[in-house]
Amino acid sequence: LLVSQGVLLKCQKGSCSNATQYEDTGDLKVNNGTRRNISNKDLCASRSADQTVLCQSEWLKYQGKCYWFSNEMKSWSDSYVYCLERKSHLLIIHDQLEMAFIQKNLRQLNYVWIGLNFTSLKMTWTWVDGSPIDSKIFFIKGPAKENSCAAIKESKIFSETCSSVFKWICQY
């Protein structure tokens, strides 16, 4: 699910279609303020079809999406901006299969930022597209409070201080 100007969109088989269950308004939040919208142009452009999706060099392809694993380290907020500037977003994990793919491609055992942070506005862990985490699929170890952001390590999700510096994963 992707947030665009005034309506939440789904990328399905390369085309963007209005999602009936959500008419969203607004842009994405980072803990210290507001960032610009992720537009459907940015995020849907690359998905013509699951089979024909082309990933840029240095990006890995999986299930019709493209993934980029950083080598340097940044805070969650800086990582968030880095992905946006490259027409992508911090990793949103949809299921355990995707988690397994990510873990297989992580070449180290340290924490890695993903696109999930705690917002005290709604008192929930929220993915960068505005959707809440599915607690039936994922459990977050650690405190749920303001300035908490999520990092993965060995297929588990941990709550960490957003100002900590870790590697990160971008996705489109």
């Epitope: 969203d24 308004t25 506005l121 709604k122 929930t124 809440p132």
Partner: antibody, heavy 112, light 110 residues
């Protein structure tokens, strides 16, 4: 869409449960608010329930009001009702990334 | 207890004129911009006009403009039209899942 029900005439000291029935919306990912409006008065936030199902209340509403939800409804239980509670009660859904309510029900009238 | 104060309580306006409504919160809204404006007409639920302090909701005419940050916010209606006769409310969103409405401003056309 959202539709409130359960509003009726009730005697002081009584209890009442209002229901907000949701259709076409994934309630599990929604932040849902209850707001009331006394006749000729302004809007007053009562409380809300977030996606994990945790409820939050205005300081004046704590104790007497309880918000809960199922997969398709959001309930507002009110106890120890007084004449001051006479109002139209609205349920409203917030947009995903803001506290702005972009979907409202038509309201249900409670008369104490 | 968060208090949101709206002024004035009522304002008269001529068609084509400008209306300014102020909204003050007793504490900072979330992210300094989590402030919404609604329009309500008798017998109807409120309608979202502006969110995040200054972003126009879908389908809302550009004559409505929101501004402000932190605790002080303003709604300006430029080139007022007959259809704008209504009561306007601001609403703040706060940490801890809290929300609060202003007392409302009635816009009367003369």
């Amino acid at each position: 869409s959202l539709e409130e029900s359960g509003g009726r005439l009730v005697t002081p000291g009584g209890s009442l449960t209002l229901t907000c029935t949701v259709s076409g919306i994934d309630l599990s990912s929604a932040y849902m608010n209850w707001v009331r409006q006394a006749p000729g008065k302004g809007l007053e936030w009562i409380g809300a329930i977030n996606s994990p199902g945790v409820a939050y209340y205005a300081s004046w509403a704590k104790g007497r009001f309880t918000i809960s939800r199922t997969s398709t409804t959001v309930d507002l239980k009110m106890t120890s009702l007084t004449t001051e509670d006479t109002a139209t009660y609205f349920c409203a859904r917030e947009a995903a990334t803001t506290s702005a309510n972009n979907l409202w029900g038509q309201g249900t009238l409670v008369t104490v | 207890q968060i208090v949101v104060t709206q002024t004035p309580a009522s304002v008269s306006a001529a068609v084509g004129g400008t209306v300014t409504i102020s909204c003050q919160s007793s504490q900072n809204v979330y992210g300094n911009n989590e402030l919404s404006w609604y329009q309500q007409k008798p017998g109807q639920p409120p309608k979202l006009l502006i969110y995040k302090a200054s972003t126009l909701a879908s389908g809302v005419p550009s004559r409505f403009k929101g501004s402000g940050s932190g605790t002080q916010f303003t709604l300006t209606i430029s080139g007022v039209q007959c259809d704008d006769a209504a009561t306007y409310y601001c609403q703040g969103g706060y940490s801890g899942g809290m929300r609060s409405f202003g007392g409302g401003t009635e816009v009367v056309l003369v």
